[in-house]
Interface confidence: low
């Protein structure tokens, strides 16, 4: 069958019919519906929402919609024994206590089951001691403290500001430094944009607002008790002592009003430079401990949260493909929220809902996509990407054989300035071509394409006239599909102006103030940015599922491989003497990249010329494109990170949110000058170059003529 036989709408109008059916008013209505009560993972409210979405997706016209449940480790505060931090005097009396909850936003005063701010998976404990301020608790911050300032965090409680890196990396760094507790806080320098009012009068974080979040270091494992396998009815579960990624010291988040009270008394060393100062009116002294008059006072944490195996529910909808039903294009985003989820995740879930409705409308008119589209509403993303990872573990054999692409659909907005896309290089051309066909929603760009406004506002640092597209990192549900399984993946959302707004994420992220009103009043009153994101995400899914030849361009992979090889080589060349001493050569990697470039070029030529009416040849060429991403997977995984198996990309070892290129080589080179055994360290660099060169060469060969 040709793709024309899959539909009764002419191919030229398929995409237009799909896009025209998407409506901003529907997205607004769905967002309102999804945000009226909390939908915390593992709660009855989130189960009810799963059933509602299942029912509505069926009404929209999907072929089947099933719930997939798993029993995973989650974490909750103790309802009768709240978490807090205190300042205690020499007699042990608590002279200051942090707040037990966020003041609820107007209109939500009587809502029950608002989980108070907590750091999910914190162990219980009541450590007390002197405070050390560690800036963002990044690797380089601890280097500055320990190596330059000679400050020892061992046995201390550290206080770190949120931002720059994933909170789990902060906690891991604090643990490695010997800290016995971690306090996380939101500094106005990072979560308060000048000239904007705090919620409910604007989109800034009020002093009582607090960011929730998990503090795991799972490295792609999914459920901490069942790494590598689904947490199903007959699962074998590890003991809690063997669980993957759990923190070993108590952790708790606070707002900047409470942080002010802790930081204003700090003594000890002055901050090393201005980059350690936030915007509170405190000295930002590093410590340890309080100054003069307050030197006998200590900080005490009171953490009583519990880890519990709890049932979670994914919703999986299927729209069967007419021509290649065994090829899957997946659109997935999570449903669980910390509280109301006004942005995270429901601004994304509302967009997915409207995309499903539009596809369903076309299907009711007799159309089907060429390939099967799977829609997913993931659970427990906030607790470590658990729903998506467990489902992918359960279905890994099908996915690795049939998975064409995964498009992620968490928050649709984190600002209203311009588009932001992170994706595999295979999708660059798809994204460029699609955005050239879509209208820009931006003021001042009326009648212009999305591509034009995006390129103007967020230009590529390398290629003039093109927009910036970033590497995939992690911290969202694409992780298992891309980093573990090697399925081509991408994500898109509207973002802020990173030039002028240096705060991390958006100010109200993971707070009680992330409401429907936040979006409707301040971010996107007309829901035009949501609609644009729906068009981008939906348009990508449409093209991936419906184009006769997969819209992947392997030549773009060749370009970035050369760029990444140049970058890692220049990092290594900071140590020219050691490279000479230990005979470190990148020749094999550059040679493999050259081969990949040549083979990709020839493949692209063949792709233009082959007989598309021959279903066997068409399927063969498409399979080569589909399996190219898979070819970058090393079955052995990265060192100490077995579930990060992509050789070209992995989440940074220092920041889960960020993507790192040639991560094996990068980590082997990181801080190599401080290694005790240089010969062993440089031997590992050489091994990683070998693995990378082999993988690139092997991937290139999958694009060669098959016989």
């Amino acid at each position: 069958k040709s793709s024309n036989e899959a539909t009764n709408i002419t191919p030229k109008h398929n995409m237009k019919a799909f896009l025209d059916e998407l409506k901003a008013e529907n997205i607004k209505k769905f967002l309102y519906n999804f945000t009226q009560i909390p939908h915390l993972a593992g709660t009855e409210q989130n189960f009810q929402l799963a059933k509602q979405i299942q029912s509505q997706w069926k009404e929209f016209g999907l072929d089947s919609v099933e719930l997939a449940h798993y029993d995973v480790l989650l974490s909750y505060p103790n309802k009768t024994h709240p978490n807090y931090i205190s300042i205690i005097n020499e007699d042990g009396n608590e002279i200051f206590n942090t707040s037990l909850f966020e003041p609820p936003p107007p209109g939500y005063e009587n809502v029950s089951d608002i989980v108070p701010p907590f750091s999910a998976f914190s162990p219980q404990g009541m450590p007390e001691g002197d405070l050390v301020y560690v800036n963002y608790a990044r690797t380089e911050d601890f280097f500055k403290l320990e190596r330059d300032m000679k400050i020892n965090c061992s046995g201390k409680i550290v206080i770190a500001r949120y931002g720059k890196v994933f909170r789990g990396n902060k906690v891991k760094n604090a643990q490695l430094a010997g800290a016995k507790g971690v306090i996380l806080y939101s500094d106005p320098a990072d979560y308060f944009a000048p000239g904007v009012k705090s919620y409910p009068d604007g989109w800034n974080l009020p002093g009582g607002g607090v960011q929730r979040g998990n503090i795991l270091n799972l490295n792609g494992a999914g459920d901490p008790l069942t790494p590598g396998y689904p947490a199903n009815e007959y699962a074998y579960r590890r003991g809690i002592a063997e669980a993957v990624g759990l923190p070993s010291i108590p952790v708790h988040p606070i707002g900047y009003y409470d942080a002010q009270k802790l930081l204003e008394k700090m003594g000890g060393s002055a901050p090393p430079d201005s980059s350690w100062r936030g915007s509170l009116k405190v000295p930002y002294n590093v410590g340890p401990g309080f100054t003069g008059n307050f030197s006998t006072q200590k900080v005490k944490m009171h953490i009583h949260s519990t880890n519990e195996v709890t049932r979670i529910y994914n919703v999986i909808g299927t729209l069967r493909g007419a021509v290649e039903p065994d090829r899957y294009v997946i659109l997935g985003g999570h449903r669980d929220s910390w509280v109301f989820g006004g942005i995270d995740p429901q601004s994304g879930a509302a967009v997915v809902h409207e995309i499903v409705r539009s596809f369903g409308t076309l299907k009711k008119e007799g159309w089907r996509p060429r390939r099967t589209i799977l829609f997913a509403s993931w659970d427990a993303e906030e607790f470590g990407l658990l729903g998506s990872t467990e489902w992918a573990e359960e279905n890994s054999r099908l996915l690795q054989e049939r998975g064409v692409a995964y498009i992620n659909a968490d928050s649709s907005i984190e600002g209203n300035y311009t588009l932001r896309v992170d994706c595999t290089p295979l999708m660059y051309s798809l994204v460029h071509n699609l955005t050239k066909e879509l209208k820009s929603p931006d003021e001042g760009f009326e009648g212009k394409s999305l591509y034009e406004s995006w390129t103007k506002k967020s230009p590529s640092p390398e290629f003039s006239g093109m927009p910036r597209i970033s590497k995939l990192g992690s911290g969202n549900d694409f992780e298992v599909f891309f980093q573990r399984l090697g399925i081509a993946s991408g994500r898109a959302r509207y973002t802020k102006n990173w030039e002028t707004n240096k705060f991390s994420g958006y100010p109200l992220y993971h707070s009680v103030y992330e409401t429907y009103e936040l979006v409707e009043k301040f971010y996107d009153p007309m829901f035009k940015y949501h609609l644009t994101v729906a068009q981008v995400r939906g348009g990508m899914v449409f093209e991936l599922a419906n184009s006769i030849v997969l819209p992947f361009d392997c030549r773009d992979y060749a370009v970035v491989l050369r760029k990444y090889a140049d970058k890692i080589y220049s990092i290594s060349m900071k140590h020219p003497q050691e490279m000479k001493t230990y005979s470190v050569s990148f020749d094999s990697l550059f040679s493999a990249v050259k081969n990949f470039t040549e083979i990709a070029s020839k493949f692209s030529e063949r792709l233009q010329d082959f007989d598309k009416s021959n279903p066997i040849v068409l399927r063969m060429m498409n399979d080569q494109l589909m399996f190219l991403e898979r070819a970058f997977i090393d079955p052995l995984g990265l060192p100490d990170r077995p579930f990060y198996r992509h050789v070209i990309y992995a989440p940074s070892s220092h920041n889960k949110y960020a993507g790192e290129s040639f991560p094996g080589i990068y980590d082997a080179l990181f801080d190599i000058e401080s290694k005790v055994d240089p010969s062993k360290a440089w031997g590992e660099v050489k091994r990683q170059i070998y693995v990378a060169a082999f993988t690139v060469q092997a991937a290139a060969e999958t694009l060669s003529e098959v016989a």
Epitope: P188, F192, N204, P206, P271, R277
Partner: antibody, heavy 124, light 107 residues
């Protein structure tokens, strides 16, 4: 419109007292920190005192501590500066100013609305 | 106390010129800095806050930059109404100190 109207200046002998008033209109007075700033003849600006929205926190420049008292009456939308034990060096134009909390609830940010100023002369 | 040192104390310029005024804090104040314009016999007027953010209604020829200890106010394409005295002000900690002022005069 948003404005601050001052009254209460004048000539006073050293050691004497004076009370300055500042009437606010056109904005929610009780939502803002307020401030007094002075300017000696031919000199630059000098901050004098700040008061929190509810009057619970007050800050003063060292040279006036113990002599000047900043206060407010939110019901009357009014700010006051009680000046006792006045000295010749207190001679200046005194301005009341609204503290614009462009950053969260802060005790000393930009002064976005100013009164017209009132002259205080301390001389024998 | 944070001491604010403003320079130059006066500058002569012509209409259309670009004028740069600097302000140095004796210790780091992050971006807690504002700039004011004052004309004779009038109250000061807020131009810039948070070191670089233009107050509503202020012409875009005024711009501010800097962070930590060193800050700059720039006036591009100087206009007749811009001849005045300019003050910087730190609000990072009490006491809230102003710089000594810079008088922009007609050349």
């Amino acid at each position: 419109q948003v404005q601050l109207v001052q009254s209460g200046g004048g000539l006073v002998q050293p050691g004497g007292s004076l009370r300055l008033s500042c009437a606010a209109s056109g904005f929610t007075f009780s939502s803002y920190w307020m401030s007094w700033v002075r300017q000696a003849p031919g000199k630059g600006l000098e901050w004098v005192a700040n008061i929190k929205q509810d009057g619970s926190e007050k800050y003063y420049v060292d040279s006036v501590k113990g002599r000047f008292t900043i206060s407010r009456d939110n019901a009357k939308n009014s700010l006051y500066l009680q000046m006792n034990s006045l000295r010749a060096e207190d001679t200046a134009v005194y301005y009341c100013a609204r503290v614009w909390d462009y950053y969260y609830d802060s005790s000393g940010d930009a002064f976005d609305i100013w009164g017209q100023g009132t002259m205080v002369t301390v001389s024998s | 106390d944070v001491v604010m040192t403003q320079s130059p104390s006066s500058v002569s310029a012509s209409v259309g010129d670009r004028v740069t005024i600097t302000c140095r804090a004796s210790q780091g104040i992050s971006s807690w800095l504002a700039w004011y314009q004052q004309k004779p016999g009038k109250a000061p007027k807020l131009l810039i806050y948070a070191a670089s953010t233009l107050q509503s209604g202020v012409p875009s020829r005024f711009s501010g930059s800097g962070s930590g200890t060193d800050f700059t106010l720039t006036i591009n394409n100087l206009q007749p109404e811009d001849f005045a005295t300019y003050y910087c002000q730190q609000t990072a900690s009490f006491p809230i100190n102003f710089g000594g002022g810079t008088k922009v005069e007609i050349k």
